[in-house]
C-alpha cells in the first residue's frame, strides 16, 4: 500500500516523492534499503533528500533499488518504500512500455495531456512535446502550462506523446522527460438507472459454516464515464463500515470494467469464517447515480458437505 | 467553515457499549496531515484525552483507556465513530470531538460536546 | 506520561490589568526546534476554544491581548490588558507525546 514504482533515465534528474505522507513540520528521513544507509540531505551530493522528495541529479543506473521514507510526527513515524529504475536510454525511437506513464483518453470536447509528474520538479515554460519522437507543429496543437491541448482530436491523434523540460537546481539545469499513451475515445456516453447485474434479486447464497465466503455487488451505469456512480454492501441495512464485525468487509475501491462499452462497478463482500449468525443477516447490494437507487438482497443459507460415503 | 457535532445515547447503564459518532464539515479526512480526536470532561473537571484518527487510518489511544477504546472513520461521510466497551459511572462526561488541523498538531476545532451519563 | 501542572489554579486580576498563567511540563515538550505546547480558553457549558499553538503563536481570531511564550518544560499565557471577557477557564496542551494531556486548568477571575 505505502510503495511506489518510479522510474527514469540515465543522466536525467528524477525527484521521487515519499508515498507517505505528513504535513509541512514533519521531518522526512531517507534511507538505501539494501544497506539502511542514509541518504544525505546536502545539496552538492548527486542523490541527496530534501524533505518528502528524494532527487537524482542526474539519474545513474546504479542508482535502482528500493529506499525507505520515514515520515516522522512527534507521536508516530510513517514509513514508506519508493522502488526506483533506473534505464539505459534507447538509441532508437521507441519508447518501452516500462518506461510509460498511465494512458490518458481524451475526445473532440477534451483533449488535454498532462505532462507525468512534472510539478515534482523546478520548471519553466514552455514544455516541448512530441509524438512517437517528433516534434509536434502546427496550429492545433498547444502547450499549456504543463499540459498539451489538441484542437479537433481525430482517432489519428492516438499515440505516445512525450513531454521534454528543464529542471533547475541551483542554477545548473537538468533534461527530464516522461511518456504516455494517448487514445481517442467516443463521446457518446450516456446514463441509466443502475442495472444490477448480479447478485439476482432474493438469491440465496450457499455458504459452509467456518469456510470463507465472497458476494459480488455488480452493476452497469450506462456508457462512457460517468459523473457519479456507485456500488455498496450493507448489512441489515447499514454500511459495513458502522456495522462493526471485522470479519465481514468491503474490497477496498471499485473495480471498473467496459463491458460492452457499459461502465459497470464491482464491491465484493469478503466474509472470514462464516458463522451461524451470519446467516440471519439481510445483504443488500446497492448500486446508485444520478437516476436514483437499487437494491438487490441477498441471504446466505448453510451448504451441506458433501458426503463422501460409497 | 469548519464545523464538528457529536452525538451519543446521552444515558447507559454500567457495562453497556458507548458510541459515539462526530460528524464534521468544512474539511475532509482524506486530505494529508488531517486528523480527528476524541476529549472528554467530567462536570467541573479537566480534560482527558482519549483518542484519535489521522488522514491515512492510523489510530493512537489514551494508554489508560487503549483496551476499551476503539476509533474509525468513515470518509465519504465526513464521520468519526469512538466505541467504548464496558461503561462505567466513572465515564459520565462531556465527550467532545475535534479537528486535528493546521502545520502542526493541536486541536484547532472542536464541536460543543455531548453528555453522557452512566447510572443504574 | 506528560505531566502538565498549571498554577495558580485560580487567578483574580483587575480589569485592564496582566494575567499570567504559567504550565510546567514534565519533560520537554520539543520537537524539531519546536515546543509543542498548546492553550485554550473554555467558557461554562461552551467547549474550548483554541488560543495559542506550538507555544507562541496567536490562533486566528484571538485577540493580541492574549500571548504564549516559552520552551522545553515552562511555559506561560498573559492577557494583557486582562477584560470582562475573558472570564473563564484556560488550559495548556502538549502534543509532544502520546497520551496527549493537558493541564488542571486555571480560572480567570476578575477582582
Known amino acids: 500500500k505505502f510503495s511506489k514504482q518510479s522510474w527514469g533515465l540515465e543522466n536525467e534528474a528524477l525527484i521521487v516523492r515519499c508515498p507517505r505522507q505528513g504535513k509541512p513540520s514533519y521531518t522526512v528521513d531517507w534511507y538505501y534499503s539494501q544497506t539502511n544507509k542514509s541518504i544525505p540531505t546536502q545539496e552538492r551530493n548527486r542523490v541527496f533528500a530534501s524533505g518528502q522528495l528524494l532527487k537524482f541529479l542526474p539519474a545513474a543506473v546504479a542508482d535502482s533499488g528500493i529506499y525507505t521514507c520515514i515520515v516522522r510526527s512527534p507521536t508516530f513515524n510513517r514509513t514508506g518504500y519508493a522502488n526506483v529504475t533506473i534505464y539505459k536510454k534507447q538509441s532508437d525511437c521507441n519508447v518501452p512500455d516500462y518506461l510509460m506513464y498511465s494512458t490518458v483518453s481524451g475526445s473532440e470536447k477534451n483533449s488535454k495531456i498532462y505532462c507525468p509528474t512534472i510539478d515534482l520538479y523546478n520548471w519553466t515554460a514552455p514544455l516541448e512535446w512530441f509524438k512517437n519522437c517528433q516534434a509536434l507543429q502546427g496550429s492545433r496543437y498547444r502547450a499549456h502550462k504543463s499540459f498539451l491541448v489538441i484542437d479537433n482530436v481525430m482517432t489519428e491523434d492516438a499515440g505516445d506523446y512525450t513531454c521534454k523540460f528543464i529542471h533547475n537546481e541551483n542554477g545548473a539545469n537538468y533534461s527530464v522527460t516522461a511518456t504516455r499513451s494517448f487514445t481517442v475515445k467516443d463521446e457518446q456516453g450516456f446514463s441509466l438507472f443502475p442495472v444490477i447485474g448480479a447478485p439476482a434479486q432474493n438469491e440465496i447464497k450457499e455458504v459452509e459454516i467456518g469456510k470463507n465466503a465472497n458476494l459480488t455487488c455488480s452493476a452497469c451505469f450506462g456508457k462512457g464515464t460517468q459523473f457519479l456512480a456507485a456500488v455498496l454492501w450493507q448489512l441489515n441495512g447499514t454500511k459495513i463500515t458502522d456495522f462493526g464485525e471485522p470479519r465481514i468487509q468491503q474490497e477496498e475501491g471499485q473495480n471498473q470494467s467496459f463491458s460492452n462499452g457499459l461502465a459497470c462497478l464491482d464491491m465484493v463482500l469478503r466474509i472470514a469464517d462464516v458463522k451461524e449468525e451470519d446467516l440471519l443477516l439481510q445483504y443488500d447490494c446497492l448500486a446508485l447515480n444520478l437516476h436514483g437507487l437499487r437494491r438487490h438482497t441477498v441471504r446466505l443459507s448453510r451448504k451441506n458437505p458433501i458426503d463422501h460415503h460409497s | 467553515q469548519v464545523t464538528l457535532k457529536e452525538s451519543g445515547p446521552g444515558i447507559l447503564q454500567p457495562s453497556q457499549t458507548l458510541s459515539l459518532t462526530c460528524s464534521f464539515s468544512g474539511f475532509s479526512l482524506s486530505t494529508s496531515g488531517m486528523g480527528v480526536g476524541w476529549i472528554r470532561q467530567p462536570s467541573g473537571k479537566g480534560l482527558e484525552w482519549l483518542a484519535h484518527?489521522?488522514?491515512?487510518?492510523?489510530?493512537q489511544y489514551n494508554p489508560a483507556l487503549k483496551s476499551r477504546l476503539t476509533i474509525s472513520k468513515d470518509t465519504s461521510s465526513s464521520q468519526v465513530f469512538l466505541k467504548s466497551a464496558s461503561v462505567d459511572t466513572a465515564d459520565t462526561a462531556t465527550y467532545y470531538c475535534?479537528?486535528?488541523?493546521?502545520?502542526?498538531?493541536?486541536?484547532?476545532?472542536w464541536g460543543q460536546g455531548t453528555t453522557l451519563t452512566v447510572s443504574s | 506520561d506528560i505531566v502538565l501542572t498549571q498554577s495558580p489554579a485560580s487567578l483574580a486580576v483587575s480589569l485592564g490589568q496582566r494575567a499570567t498563567i504559567s504550565c510546567r511540563a514534565s519533560?520537554?515538550?520539543?520537537?524539531?526546534?519546536?515546543?509543542?505546547m498548546q492553550w485554550y480558553q473554555q467558557k461554562p457549558g461552551q467547549p474550548p476554544k483554541l488560543l495559542i499553538y506550538?507555544?507562541?503563536n496567536v490562533e486566528s481570531g484571538v485577540p493580541a491581548r492574549f500571548s504564549g511564550s516559552g520552551s522545553g518544560t515552562d511555559f506561560s499565557l498573559n492577557i494583557h490588558p486582562v477584560e470582562e471577557d475573558d472570564i473563564a477557564m484556560y488550559f495548556c496542551q502538549q502534543s509532544r507525546k502520546v497520551p496527549w494531556t493537558f493541564g488542571g486548568g486555571t480560572k480567570l477571575e476578575i477582582k
Open positions: 475535534a479537528r486535528i488541523g493546521g502545520d502542526y498538531d493541536y486541536f484547532d476545532f
Open positions: 506550538v507555544a507562541s
Open positions: 484518527i489521522w488522514w491515512d487510518d492510523v489510530k
Open positions: 519533560e520537554s515538550v520539543e520537537y524539531s526546534g519546536t515546543s509543542l
